[in-house]
């Protein structure tokens, strides 16, 4: 999606099928207020952005309302009347789902079910990553809805969990973004903890009677 024209790099993110953010990085125009012009229909006249993003006092992007659209964004980034970058993109291929909300944990012996609010569209994967201080890397499990059960946990260990949402590549293609991670939550013996110790505490020696 980057593509350079006159040294302009662009990035498109379609936040949760709600808002499209187009940002640009144009070293040649770093002290210039470039303008953003767009349309959702190839036959219409361009509209100018009304919600610019600023970086060091100069325009660096545009936010557009685009509720549940599955069509092409035609856009032109201009220096005055001179187009410095013109392109068209299918917005949905740059989807970034929103971060999971209302994350809940339900423990039953050596298993936990992680739930959260499902998003209002489909073909998503809800991924839970978890680890204990004994683990060298995060382990992962994902499902098509935000109802993920992880089994075989050690009740005595402290585990850190976080959750995110990903768009299925088979449907949305390879250029989407995963959601931001939810906050890390730590659990031990079915109870929430402030944190898991970074280094596992050695087992206490058994005292002989």
């Amino acid at each position: 999606q980057g593509g350079a024209a006159e040294g302009v790099q662009i990035q498109i993110i379609y936040f949760n099928l709600e808002t499209v953010q187009v940002t640009w990085n144009a070293s040649k125009y770093s002290r210039t207020n470039l303008t953003f012009h767009y349309r959702f229909n190839g036959d219409e006249a361009y509209d100018q952005c009304t919600n610019y993003l600023l970086q060091e006092g100069h325009t660096s992007g545009c936010l557009l309302d685009a509720e549940q659209r599955d069509d092409i964004l035609y856009f032109s980034i201009r220096n005055g009347t001179h187009p410095v970058f013109t392109a068209s993109r299918w917005m949905v291929y740059y989807l970034k789902p929103s971060s999971p909300k209302h994350v809940r944990f339900s423990w039953h012996q050596d298993a936990v079910t992680v739930t959260c609010s499902d998003l209002s569209y489909g073909d998503l994967l809800y991924e839970v990553q978890y680890r204990s201080p004994f683990d060298t890397e995060w382990q992962s499990k994902q499902e098509n809805t935000c109802n993920v059960t992880i089994e075989g946990l050690d009740a005595e260990k402290c585990y850190s969990f976080w959750v995110r949402v990903k768009a299925m590549e088979d449907v949305y293609g390879p250029d989407t973004y995963p959601s931001d991670w939810s906050e890390v939550t730590c659990w031990q013996r079915g109870e929430i903890r402030d944190a898991c110790a970074e280094t596992p505490t050695p087992p206490k020696p058994k005292l002989s009677k």
Epitope: L17, Q68, R69, D70, D71, W90, Y121, T145
Partner: antibody, heavy 119, light 107 residues
């Protein structure tokens, strides 16, 4: 609003091929949305077959993918469903429709075209 | 694949009756469910999407509810033109699947 008209149905022998067409009007199939085929066997329920997105990407029902191919002709604003190695159980009314990625429900439908696979 | 099971498969009702059709998914599908009405020889028509949102032009007597695995289509006061077959459909994950249909007949 978009209008969809299917054609190409008829009687075909098992093992043979058939190509269905769906002509869209009032909306360019390259401008947006997904363009699915859905079928319905006589007296039975509905089954999603495949779709082609306006970008050209395709997705299929895994149970049919090896035999069915979805395509389009942009200049004619027309979708196609190529069906190979047809079987008696492919006998159905085939509908084209419009949906969108992430929200794959079917808001607009054609009138359907009947395919009968019989010797 | 996700199975969508509708009940009843058919029902008889009179004009003015309140009619409820249920659809059960074999696993959670969030709120990603649509409902359609189909009359003999015609293409289906979208009634409800996202479990509870009426499609444009659909009369207010049609309503949908539910999330997860259990969904309901309600016709608050059955009209003569409502005698038809109704289908639910999940679009939470492909392959997108439909219920087997519920035929609403005149009593």
């Amino acid at each position: 609003q978009v209008q969809l008209v299917e054609s190409g149905g008829g009687v075909v022998q098992p093992g043979r091929s058939l190509r269905l067409s769906c002509a869209a009007s009032n909306y360019s199939i390259t401008s947006g949305y997904s363009w699915p085929w859905v079928r319905q066997a006589p007296g039975k329920g509905l089954e999603w077959v495949a779709y082609i997105h306006s970008s050209g990407r395709t997705n299929y029902n895994p149970s049919l993918k090896s035999r069915f191919t979805i395509s389009r002709d942009n200049s004619k604003n027309t979708l196609y469903l190529q069906m190979n190695s047809l079987r008696a159980e492919d006998t159905a009314v085939y509908y084209c429709a419009r949906s969108q990625l992430g929200l794959v429900f079917f808001a607009y439908w054609g009138q359907g075209t009947l395919v009968t696979v019989s010797s | 694949d996700i199975q969508m099971t509708q009940s009843p498969s058919s029902l008889s009702a009179s004009v003015g009756d309140r009619v409820t059709i249920t659809c059960k998914a074999s696993q959670s599908v969030g709120a990603n469910v649509a409902w359609y009405q189909q009359k003999p020889g015609k293409a289906p028509k979208l009634l409800i999407y996202s479990a509870s949102y009426r499609f444009s032009g659909v009369p207010s007597r049609f309503s949908g509810s539910g999330s997860g695995t259990d969904f309901t289509l309600t016709i608050s006061s059955l009209q003569p033109e409502d005698f038809a077959t109704y289908y639910c459909q999940q679009y939470n994950s492909y392959p997108y699947t439909f219920g087997q249909g519920t035929k609403v007949e005149i009593k």
